[in-house]
Amino acid sequence: QRLPWMQEDSPLGGGSSGEDDPLHEEDLPSEEDPPREEDPPREEDLPEVKPKSEEEGSLKLEDLPTVEAPGDPQEPQNNAHRDKEGDNQRHWRYGGDPPWPQVSPACAGRFQSPVDIRPQLAAFCPALRPLELLGFELPLLPELRLRNNGHSVQLTLPSGLEMALGPGREYRALQLHLHWGAVGRPGSEHTVEGHRFPAEIHVVHISTAYARVEEALGRPGGLAVLAAFLEEGPEENSAYEQLLSHLEEIAEEGSETQVPGLDVSALLPSDLSRYFRYEGSLTTPPCAQGVIWTVFNQTVMLSAKQLHALSDALWGPGDSRLQLNFRVTQPLNGRVIEASFPAGVDSSPRAAEPVQLNSCLAAGD
């Protein structure tokens, strides 16, 4: 499945939950905004909470997670709130207090991620060559660590997975993780013309110029992330099933399991030549900037059952379901998103004379 621009034969996939948001209203509130206390949470917006055992007493109102006030139905819900452990509430979370810049000042930076991608405004850069992945086809052994890290499912990758953004710009993969929504609610981090996809995969890489991640954090090009949108399709995705089939083993926050090695490249689109590129940040605290983002044009298809399993299997902080774990889109603040293909050109009659507002400045850098 490819995204709709430049695709005469490929309409937008029908399985994507959520509606387009042409006004980009979902960008208005962000997790840095405090919840509006005057609006009581709707019951259907409350994350599901594990039932307490009888000896713990009945569920009290103050035990329920607080929720961002009703607004855009695609807003991330406030999934972490008051911990059952009763410790302080300073930890970061989606959709509510504490404001992320209080948690980590870099979250108030000017060049944050994710962003809304508007293909018509992307700068076509012919110098952006197809990505090359080396060593991504892993043997079954040694096994890999799959973990519920509290806000996502994360697969730790061994050394040897190499990726180049261009000549002399080499990276090695560290880990991959996913972002998703809830039943009937999409949860990708990046959006396209305001459209949010059901889910998104991030494969995080470190520049070979750095030995350790903390050295690379905040340095321009220190980290690079390959991102792809996950959409609903008619068939089960066998590559993803190798991970999703283990989710029950890591339902509890902080739990982990071992899974056989797999072909990591099979989790990404087959077309690695058409993508968007921009410089942004990590999408969770510490929100370090200087991250090179590559967002593929082609989407990856999972079955409805697989997408449901992803959004329904894990538990996060405070025994609330781990759902809607995406950050709202951040302002570009003058950044130009580059495209490796002429994304601003549309084959439909109404766009016979596309306006290409931005030119390619970086030429692949």
């Epitope: 300073r90 930890h91 954090l217 902080g254 982990e256």
Partner: nanobody, 133 residues
């Protein structure tokens, strides 16, 4: 060289106090979750207390809540575990561990403290605490 090193373990009487120290060298703890873990003979390693340098959040296991306090000295790149009202069941080898915090590693301090195997980025060698009369 990148490492974590614990110190401060000792033999102490029940009801007594100890302060364990964890020194990080070769890297800064700024982007890390730091945890104190312990392993008693014949038992699984368990998370005692965890702290995030990123958002300041803390976690304490039920068995130590109200008795133990985790803290960090940014200038010295040290993490401490103040242990009061010690009990014989606190006897164990205490380990310090650090793992990247956020989407690159553990995203909550609870998740950090539930790491029962040395799968974190950095683990120390441990310091022995014995509570006995």
């Amino acid at each position: 060289q990148v490492k974590l090193e614990e110190s401060g373990g000792d033999l102490v009487q029940p009801g007594g106090s100890l302060r364990l120290s964890c020194a990080a060298s070769g890297f800064t703890l700024d982007y890390y979750a730091i945890g104190w873990f312990r392993q008693a003979p014949g038992k699984e390693r368990e998370g005692v207390s965890c702290f995030s340098s990123v958002d300041g959040s803390t976690y304490y296991a039920d068995s130590v809540k109200g008795r133990f306090t985790i803290s960090r000295d940014n200038a010295k790149n040290m993490v401490y575990l103040q242990m009061n009202s010690l009990k014989p069941e606190d006897t164990a080898i205490y380990y310090c561990a650090a793992e990247l915090y956020g989407e690159l590693g553990v995203a909550t301090v609870q998740a950090m403290c539930r790491l029962t195997t040395p799968g974190g980025d950095y683990w120390g060698q441990g310091t022995q605490v014995t509570v006995s009369s």
